[in-house]
Amino acid sequence: IPTEIPTSALVKETLALLSTHRTLLIANETLRIPVPVHKNHQLCTEEIFQGIGTLESQTVQGGTVERLFKNLSLIKKYIDGQKKKCGEERRRVNQFLDYLQEFLGVMNTEWIIES
Amino acid sequence: IPTEIPTSALVKETLALLSTHRTLLIANETLRIPVPVHKNHQLCTEEIFQGIGTLESQTVQGGTVERLFKNLSLIKKYIDGQKKKCGEERRRVNQFLDYLQEFLGVMNTEWIIES
């Protein structure tokens, strides 16, 4: 798979492959994987990809299911790259405050907050 | 501050305090703090709160600016709690796949993806 495929297209294709291979993937009746109990997904990327690793190690490889796991590994690579960009630019306090304000604003309007 | 205040109310109050104390906070002309270069805030919570720590250590405390940093520390506590919940529940594969599908769906529709 060329890593040049846009990440948005990669995600779409991965969603389709996930549907296609669902029956194969759920064949292991006894396997248990940690599942986050809230919907703030970005907080849980580490656990999600650990779960994917567990699933991959328990799944017979070959054909397009291999492509599914390859895609998921490219998505992880993209997310790891995004995480690296969290601390790259050192800026004046006013800019940090604007980012903090935006973060809290998004938290206020978009996060699923259970008190 | 009672920690029983709902997190959503805490976030709203913190946004207001951030506006109130902006002039005081930006007084340090030479301080530089890492600012994430993308809008996927949840991926950067660690760096954001490190930045808040840097800012707090450089800010004269007292009055309601102290309340601002106390609030931010309670918000951090809430987010740390959410992160703990990422791997608490072990579930069958089909449940993990449902969560993974939702995660990719949200990534597909809501994330700011720069290829």
């Epitope: 630019e89 004046r92 800019q95 604007d98 604003g105 | 030479t30 809008k39 720069e114």
Partner: antibody, heavy 117, light 109 residues
Framework: QVQLQESGPGLVKPSQTLSLTCTVS??????????WSWIRQHPGKGLEWIGY???????YYNPSLKSRVTISVDTSKNQFSLKLSSVTAADTAVYYC?????????WGQGTLVTVSS | SYVLTQPPSVSVAPGQTARITCGGN??????VYWYQQKPGQAPVLVVH???DRPSGIPERFSGSNSGNTATLTISRVEVGDEADYSC???????????FGGGTKLTVLG
């Protein structure tokens, strides 16, 4: 490498509104490390800061122009815009857009706007 | 609001040292940025954070800042250095950007 390009009419009539757009390429306008700024330069004079905007929409304006200036951002088009209302001949200048980190890193080439009837 | 004052012009012979000043109330507590602008071109940063040079800017360009005056120093001046030079700071009390009026550097001869 980030590049910025100003576009808009080069001639505006007095009392009308000057409108310019800056298109950003080679980088995302949603980059949290940058403000997006407008600066102008009257013929033979120094640089004058007009204002800047953050991707979230927070704006900061030069107090001397604040009552007439609006800066907006369109993250979907990777563009930001300047509107300056009630223009007079004194608003004739070269208008630059620029990215502003700790300093002005990248500049457009500038566009001359003449206010004349 | 905060005001920066620069001399309108400075003249210097090639090979000599040019000093361009930027005055402001307690400017030493602020970070100062210097831009070079040649006719018909956009400005280019030559010094940031008082005395740091961006990559690609010759070592001949240096800066200092203390008290009420920041100074851009260009040593061994060349004909190609002839340009307008502007200083810039942030006014942290208002989150505003402030430019000096600019100084025209003329290289004699």
């Amino acid at each position: 490498q980030v590049q910025l390009q100003e576009s808009g009419p080069g001639l505006v009539k007095p009392s009308q509104t000057l409108s310019l757009t800056c298109t950003v390429s080679g980088g995302s306008i949603s980059n949290g490390g940058y403000y997006w700024s407008w600066i102008r330069q009257h013929p033979g004079k120094g640089l004058e800061w007009i204002g800047y905007i953050y991707y979230s929409g927070s704006t900061y304006y030069n107090p001397s122009l604040k009552s007439r200036v609006t800066i907006s951002v369109d993250t979907s088009k990777n563009q930001f815009s300047l509107k300056l209302s009630s223009v007079t001949a004194a608003d004739t200048a070269v208008y630059y857009c620029a990215s502003l980190g700790n300093w002005f890193d990248y500049w457009g080439q500038g566009t001359l706007v003449t206010v004349s009837s | 609001s905060y005001v920066l004052t620069q001399p309108p012009s400075v003249s210097v012979a090639p090979g000599q040292t040019a000093r361009i000043t930027c005055g402001g109330n307690n400017i030493g507590s602020k970070s100062v940025y210097w831009y070079q602008q040649k006719p018909g071109q956009a400005p280019v940063l030559v010094v940031h954070d008082d005395s740091d040079r961006p990559s690609g800017i010759p070592e001949r360009f240096s800066g200092s800042n203390s008290g009420n005056t920041a100074t851009l120093t260009i040593s061994r001046v060349e004909v190609g250095d002839e340009a307008d030079y502007s200083c810039q700071v942030w006014d942290s009390s208002s989150d505003h950007v402030v430019f000096g009026g600019g100084t025209k550097l003329t290289v004699l001869g």
